[in-house]
């Protein structure tokens, strides 16, 4: 433990301002009161503080509140925010989303930093479950957030929630997550009508399911090759040429360019050339005409 | 109105010393810094340092540190920036601004500087 | 020594808007509120259009504004006028060296 040094005459800080910048080191840590830097924490910002002297004023308020610092400092702390370690972070208990916003303003535009992945942890973790206004506030400053949790994270998602989501926001989600993300999708907008609700749905039909694709394509939905790359191989294998046809709509010429390409390469292994032919793309590779197709998975199955 | 007033150009020999002044009026000048920024013919600006009028406290640019020193005399309002040997590099347009909180709001009309043999 | 970068020259009609980009590290740009933009005529004094980043002094006019993201701080000018045309040059504070650096300049010319 450093031996403290009495604050010269005339120089204890009486408030939180401009000229503190002025005050070495030592004379910040004898003259600044602990109590009124955590009072008028909104002040800092406002100070052109060099980087030793921040570490000073975060050193007083580590002293000051070793258990973690009370919420009303957190919301202040603006860059000081970026002085903070993990560790640090993992004392707090944040509650308000105000103070989250608060804390993410000072990182945006910027990585997520282990400062803030701690941060968000423990807020949520706080709350008990992803609720839309947080989902809402991460994926503005973090559009990747969603996708970064784990299917188990993504469980305690609320379908309410699902209406903040975003289709930039699912841009890095992985099979795996979509899986979980896709039911809680379709149980939010199962109210909407079918071309309002095919827009919502869209982005999570990586997740879905044949028999769902199989409800889309009597819907005249028209889906995009890009959409249609991005679903489970699993479930693109089951549907029929005129299943594919009536889900891409106008989108099935498309096809000849990725047909190398899963799922559309597998798809093709699995049709009839017949059936192939019949789009007139020049599609090749489905099954001779005259074979016969044993769905082994079936067979598996009943015995 | 607010206003800083800079002393007049000044022509100089190396190794001449040299104490340009800028003053302030307006306001109350011990509650506002006052920074000094260089900016050489035809170049940007670069910022050299600062003083808390009230105190004379100073804050350089490691750039700048002992090549000027800034002081001020808060009885008449006046900052000051000297050489005590100048150079040929010192040539330049040297401008006085009050610090407001997050910017320097309020300029002086700039001192130019020439110093050549 | 310039800490900050910006680009050496921008143009734009009258009418038009845009963008002056000023780019720095975590520690100047990215690390505090501190950005503040000058305006600057030929043999004329600088003078202040944004600080705290987004805030606009008394006087001057709404078509400038001021925005940060990242390390990169960005000024905005909307409905360009003639007498725009002028050198810029964003501040920023540097906390760990404990001093005030400028961006090298944008000369905007209006076409």
């Known amino acids: 433990e450093v031996e403290k040094t009495a604050c010269p005459s005339g120089k204890k800080a009486r408030e939180i301002d401009e000229s503190l910048i002025f005050y070495k080191k030592w004379e910040l840590e004898a003259c600044v009161d602990a109590a009124l830097l955590a009072t008028q924490m909104d002040r800092v910002n406002a100070i052109p503080f060099t980087y030793e002297q921040l570490d000073v004023l975060k050193h007083k308020l580590d002293e000051l509140y070793p258990q973690g610092y009370p919420e009303s400092v957190i919301q202040h702390l603006g860059y000081l925010f970026l002085k903070m370690s993990p560790e640090d972070i993992r004392k707090w208990n944040v509650t308000s989303l105000e103070t989250l916003k608060a804390l993410l303003e000072v990182n945006k535009g910027h990585e997520m930093s282990p400062q803030v992945a701690t941060l968000i942890d423990r807020f949520v973790k706080g709350r008990g479950q992803l609720d839309k206004d947080t989902l809402d506030t991460l994926t503005a400053f973090y559009p990747g957030y969603l996708c970064s949790l784990s299917p188990e994270e993504l469980s305690s998602v609320p379908p309410s929630s699902i209406w903040a989501v975003r289709p930039q926001d699912l841009d890095t989600c992985d099979p795996r997550q979509l899986d979980v993300l896709y039911p809680k999708a379709r149980l939010a907008f199962q109210n909407m009508n079918g071309s309002e609700y095919f827009v919502k749905i869209q982005s999570f039909l990586g997740g879905a399911p044949t028999e769902d694709l199989k409800a889309l394509s009597q819907q005249n939905v028209s889906m995009d090759l890009a959409t249609f790359m991005k679903l489970r191989t699993d479930a693109v294998l089951p549907l029929t040429v005129a299943e594919v046809q009536k889900l891409l709509g106008p989108h099935v010429e498309g096809l000849k360019a990725e047909e190398r390409h899963r799922p559309v390469r597998d798809w093709i292994l699995r049709q009839r050339q017949d059936d192939l032919d019949t789009l007139g793309l020049g599609l090749q590779g489905g099954i001779p005409n005259g074979y016969l197709v044993l769905d082994l998975s079936m067979q598996e199955a009943l015995s | 109105q607010v206003q800083l007033v800079q002393s007049g150009a000044e022509v100089k020999k190396p190794g001449e010393s040299l104490k340009i002044s800028c003053k302030g009026s307006?306001?109350?000048?011990?509650?506002?810094?006052i920074g000094w920024v260089r900016q050489m013919p035809g170049k940007g600006l670069e910022w050299m340092g600062i003083?808390?009028?009230?105190?004379?406290?100073?804050r350089y640019s490691p750039s700048f540190q002992g090549q000027v020193t800034i002081s001020a005399d808060k009885s008449i309002s006046t900052a000051y920036l000297q050489w005590s040997s100048l150079k040929a590099s010192d040539t330049a347009m040297y401008y006085c601004?009050?610090?407001?909180?997050?910017?320097?709001?309020?300029w002086g009309q700039g001192t130019l500087v020439t110093v050549s043999s | 020594d310039i800490a900050l970068t910006q680009p050496a020259s921008v143009s734009g009609s009258p009418g038009q808007s845009i963008t002056i980009s000023c780019t720095g590290t975590?520690?100047?740009?990215?690390?505090?509120?501190?950005v503040s933009w000058y305006q600057q005529h030929p043999g004329k004094a600088p003078k202040l259009m944004i600080y705290?980043?987004?805030s606009r002094p008394s006087g001057v006019s709404n078509r400038f504004s001021g925005s940060k993201s990242g390390n990169t701080a960005s000024l905005t000018i909307s409905g360009l006028q003639a007498e725009d045309e002028a050198d810029y040059y964003c501040?920023?504070?540097?906390?760990?060296?404990?001093?005030?650096?400028f961006g090298g300049g944008t000369k905007l010319t209006v076409l």
């Open positions: 501040q920023s504070w540097d906390a760990p060296m404990g001093m005030w650096v």
């Open positions: 307006g306001y109350s000048f011990t509650n506002y810094w």
């Open positions: 003083i808390d009028p009230r105190e004379s406290f100073t």
């Open positions: 975590s520690s100047d740009v990215g690390g505090n509120n501190f």
């Open positions: 705290y980043g987004d």
């Open positions: 601004a009050r610090y407001m909180k997050g910017g320097y709001d309020y």
